[in-house]
């Protein structure tokens, strides 16, 4: 019957295992008349055999080593062996099985790596080869280190990618390798096939020694350099020194100094430019980079510390002009009046900063003179003879002497006598009621007013009035600013109320001078007083927990895999249901309720990456608001995609006859990432037969010449295909065709006689 | 060795029928196609078409369908080609000819000729 | 069908002389699948049937002097008899096999003088 194994004749693939005898009959092809009789051509090898009445099959095991697809056509032939249907193609894929053990390239490998070189950047490769399928487990090498020798308190220094069979450095092997303690090593290195996942895979080992190299590349120590420098600058301060001569050094400025006043000569000096002054900057942190002549940094930049070291080129300054102190007229002896702070911008807690205070004058002198004593390194101001009669002298006038080591500067004092606190401020209500308010009122918004008096003295800070929440108002949501003239109170919203955590707050208000009650009189409850503020409730949309979700996957990950999540809550607790905007590619799907996001269709990093879409979150039931966040979905690059022509190489051609053999260069491309080395194409004729008359030869990773391999070609288009391999993991493989016309030629052009043919070439090689 | 052996002269009456043979010696009679062609005097060679002995399968040239009939006996080797309705204009030389190709021989021309009927047409 | 023609119809040259003959065809008879041209020569001397001489346009059969060459393609094609003997005296014909009905062209009469 018509089916798996019999039918009409058309393009058909075939694969069959390698390694296996025949054991049945690939197809039979069916003739429609007046075909009586088939015909097998292209790369048979002299395996595959098509019998008269058009039974396909082969004559002995297969294998995909020597070639991996075989690539036959099939014509219907008539009695004459004319033609008369196809030739079609058919492909037989020759799968892989594991016949073939990985082989090390070399059986010992040396190298050689720095001492603190950078954890994980490879200094040797070892590569072995496998015949088989890389595409399968049967071809996937498995890189490891069987043993370090010597091994050191059981610390492995070296680490090899047992992908890429690329040995780098541990974290320990970068810190603690030293040539003075050890300097070789030698590591056993075994690679299996099967990923090294089965019992049954195969193996090798090769032998590496290891040259551990002294790295003077080191961050030197931090340099001292004292400000306000005299000498002839520039002045070398440091160096650094790469391992080998011919580095290009440069400073990086990680913090974009308007002023760097640092420079690096070829030979690794350090040097200051300038004079530092420590008051506008203190400590100086930048980067010394070695390079090659390429400009590619050579290892990780060394950190420069230099620290500027103070000298005492700063006096003492006053806080202010005039400072204005208060002082009760009953207060005590040594009841502390006030402090003054001078400043010094000499560096902190050194002799340059540390200020003295002495009071020089007193005016009037009145009762007496040396009625206030100041503490020569507080600056605390105190009462020291006596109380002060206000009637008598309402105020004193102090010039204070502060000085640091060097530097001499006068402060001015005045002291006001002012009446006793002996009144407490008392409020004008004890209860302001109840407040309503909805949660979104805004910020900054006056909600209460509130009063309270005091019969001390006016305007002096016996009487001047603060008002605290000292109840109700954990979060800081509420603040009270005061009218200094006035004394009212003016309750303001400082954060956004929320009805979902505190939807009553009972308020307490209490009101203080600043000025200390006199002995023996305290605050009591008339210098408190309540509210209730009452909130209500806004409905209000989801919130996401962050404006942007980003997820990170691979192109190839199968359909149904959860590629990210993300999530948003109600504030008045509503359920939640999740959706997507702006999936233009149809990629990804939303579970409604967890928010979890899921690839519905195959990824295609080469169709742009990060894909971005929006999520949305609704409540359910309610007013169904919603909030809108960004889901980035960046995607890793696979090789999915293979080798192609760079552009249309239609229109080449050579003039016939050719006087010597001619050869063009042609560039290959492909759409996946290529990280740092860019391509590494390799070339070769896309079928035996092409190989009397052509020959490819590789220029670089992406070019290649196509050469003429004798003189005696007709005149007609020739298409040679060629085979470009991307070598990746899994390697993917591109044939394509290059049309190339032998002609006759006027000047150097292709001559056709007029209305001859169309799409006359027009590149001549 | 390989031979056609084709009757040497036919002469026939306008409107009569003749039928001439082609026998073929030295390979099997199934293996290849034979073809018929005309030679008028002076004049160029015509393809009538072929016959394919293995299981019949025959290709006549349009021009001369309805003139021609061709056939073959394999028992005893021989092709042969009917003429009808026959008239001056059909007087010439008629050759057979084995064609080249056959399963795995690939020989595209004609590699074995009779030596020709002679047909004349008169009353 | 595919009409071929010949010239010139006849020629008359010596003996060690270089011939060519043109052959003609109204429609390309390269075969895309596999780049051959589908045409062959024969020679009919006087009196016998015809015999080949090169099929596939350029290939001699064997046996064959190499003294005759095919060559061209697509239309265009050409018989060369590079040093005339005095038995090549003959008709020489071009016949295509690219399409059903097979047409032969009208000949060449090689004449020796």
């Known amino acids: 019957q018509e089916g798996k194994f019999s039918g009409p004749l058309k393009p058909m693939t075939f694969s069959i295992y390698e390694g296996q005898e025949p054991s049945q009959i690939i197809f039979q092809f069916k003739a429609n008349p007046p075909a009586v009789t088939f015909e097998l051509t292209g790369e048979t090898d002299n395996i595959f055999v098509i019998e008269r009445e058009g039974l396909l099959y082969y004559n002995r095991a297969l294998d995909r080593e020597t070639r991996s697809t075989h690539n036959l056509q099939v014509a219907a032939l008539d009695a004459n062996g004319i033609i008369v249907e196809g030739p079609v193609p058919i492909t037989i894929k020759v799968k892989d099985i594991n016949d073939n053990r990985p082989t090390f390239l070399q059986s010992k490998y040396e190298g050689s790596v720095r001492q603190n070189s950078r954890p994980g950047k490879p200094f040797l490769y070892v590569n072995a080869t496998d015949l088989d399928d890389p595409a399968t487990p049967n071809g996937q090498l498995y890189y490891q280190i069987v043993i370090q020798l010597p091994m050191i308190n059981n610390v492995m220094y070296f680490q090899i990618n047992n992908k890429t069979g690329a040995i780098s450095l541990t974290r320990e092997g970068s810190q603690e390798l030293n040539p003075a303690k050890n300097p070789s090593y030698n590591l056993v290195i075994s690679v299996k096939d099967m990923g090294g996942q089965s019992e049954n895979s195969f193996s090798d080992t090769t032998s590496v020694d290891i040259i551990v190299t002294e790295n003077i590349w080191k961050a030197p120590k931090p340099v001292e350099m004292v400000e306000n420098s005299t000498d002839p600058h520039p002045i070398k301060i440091t160096q650094v020194r790469w391992n080998d001569p011919g580095a290009q050094y440069s400073l990086v400025d990680k913090e974009k100094l308007p002023r760097f006043p640092f420079s690096i000569d070829q030979e690794g000096d350090i040097y200051v430019t300038q004079p530092l002054d420590r008051e506008e900057k203190d400590a100086y942190v930048f980067y010394a980079v070695a390079k090659d002549e390429y400009g590619k940094p050579l290892s990780y930049p060394l950190e420069i510390h230099v620290k500027v070291k103070d000298i005492n080129d700063n006096p003492p300054t006053c806080p202010s002009p005039v400072t204005v102190f208060e002082v009760q007229e009953n207060e005590r002896l040594g009841n502390s009046i006030g402090t003054l702070t001078a400043h010094d911008r000499d560096e902190e807690n050194t002799a340059n900063s540390f200020l003295n205070y002495r009071i020089v004058e007193q005016t009037p002198k009145l009762p007496m003179d040396g009625l206030f004593l100041i503490q020569t390194y507080a600056g605390m101001l105190q009462l020291a003879k006596q109380s002060l009669k206000k009637q008598d002298t309402p105020q004193y006038n102090l010039t204070i002497e502060v000085s640091d080591k060097d530097f001499k500067t006068l402060c001015f004092v005045q002291i006001n006598v002012i009446d006793i606190n002996d009144q407490i401020p008392i409020f004008e209500k004890s209860d302001y009621g109840n407040l309503t308010l909805a949660e979104d009122t805004n910020i900054g918004s006056t909600i209460l007013t509130i009063q309270a008096t005091d019969a001390d003295e006016p305007f002096t800070g016996s009487s001047k009035i603060l008002y605290h929440i000292i109840k109700g108002d954990s979060e800081g949501r509420l603040g009270v600013d005061t009218d200094p003239h006035t004394n009212t109170g003016y309750v303001i919203i400082k954060k956004p109320l929320d009805f979902e955590t505190a939807a009553v707050s009972n308020i307490v208000f209490k009101a203080e001078n600043p000025e200390p009650l006199v002995f023996g009189v305290k605050y009591n409850a008339s210098s408190f007083a309540k509210f209730t503020l009452i909130v209500t409730d806004v409905n209000e949309a989801p919130q996401f927990s962050q404006h942007v979700f980003q997820a990170k996957v691979s192109e190839d990950v199968a359909i149904g895999t959860k590629v990210g999540n993300v999530t948003a809550k109600d504030p008045e607790g509503l359920d939640i249901s999740y959706s997507l905007r702006g999936d233009t590619r149809g990629w990804l799907k939303i579970d409604h309720v967890t928010g979890e996001i899921f690839s519905v269709a195959p990824l295609d990093r080469e169709a742009g990456s990060p894909y971005r879409v929006q999520v949305v979150a609704t409540e359910v039931g309610g007013s169904s608001l919603s909030s809108v966040s960004e889901f980035h979905l960046i995607l890793m690059d696979v090789n999915d995609n293979p080798p192609r022509l760079a552009k249309d190489y239609t229109g080449l051609f050579f003039c016939h006859p050719l006087s010597a053999p001619g050869s063009l260069i042609f560039e290959a491309t492909d759409d996946d990432q290529h990280l740092f080395r860019g391509p590494h194409f390799t070339f070769s004729l896309g079928s035996g037969s092409l190989q009397n008359d052509w020959e490819v030869s590789k220029i670089n990773g992406t070019h290649a010449r196509l050469s003429t391999r004798h003189t005696e070609f007709e005149e007609r288009e020739y298409v040679v295909l060629i085979r470009i391999n991307d070598g990746g993991r899994p390697p993917l493989e591109g044939i394509v065709s290059l049309p190339v016309t032998f002609c006759s030629c006027v000047e150097g052009s292709c001559f056709r006689p007029a209305g001859h043919q169309t799409g006359i070439p027009t590149v001549g090689m | 060795e390989v031979q056609l052996q084709q009757s040497v002269a036919e002469l026939v009456k306008p409107g009569a029928s003749v039928k001439m043979s082609c026998k073929v010696s030295?390979?099997?009679?199934?293996?290849?196609?034979i073809h018929w062609m005309k030679q008028r005097p002076e004049q160029g060679l015509e393809w009538i078409g072929y016959?394919?002995?293995?299981?019949?399968?025959?290709g006549y040239n349009e021009k001369f369908k309805g003139k021609a009939t061709l056939t073959a006996d394999t028992s005893s080797s021989t092709a042969y080609m009917q003429l009808n309705s026959l008239t001056s204009e059909d007087s010439a030389v008629y050759f057979c000819?084995?064609?080249?190709?056959?399963?795995?021989?690939?020989?595209?021309?004609?590699?074995?000729w009779g030596q020709g009927t002679t047909l004349t047409v008169s009353s | 069908d595919i009409v071929m023609s010949q010239s010139p119809s006849s020629l008359a040259v010596s003996v060690g002389e270089k011939v060519t003959m043109s052959c003609k065809s109204s429609q390309s008879l390269l075969h895309s699948s596999n780049q051959k041209n589908y045409l062959a020569w024969y020679q009919q001397k006087p009196g016998q049937s015809p015999k080949v001489l090169i099929y596939?346009?350029?290939t001699r059969e064997s046996g064959v002097p190499d003294r005759f060459t095919g060559s061209g393609s697509g239309t265009d094609f050409t018989l060369t008899i590079t040093s005339v003997k005095s038995e090549d005296l003959a008709v020489y014909y071009c016949?295509?096999?690219?399409?059903?009905?097979?047409?032969f062209g009208g000949g060449t009469r090689l004449e020796i003088k």
């Open positions: 016959i394919y002995p293995r299981d019949g399968i025959t």
């Open positions: 016949q295509q096999y690219y399409s059903y009905p097979w047409t």
């Open positions: 030295g390979y099997t009679l199934t293996d290849h196609t």
């Open positions: 596939w346009a350029s």
């Open positions: 000819a084995r064609w080249g190709y056959s399963y795995r021989n690939y020989a595209y021309y004609y590699d074995y």
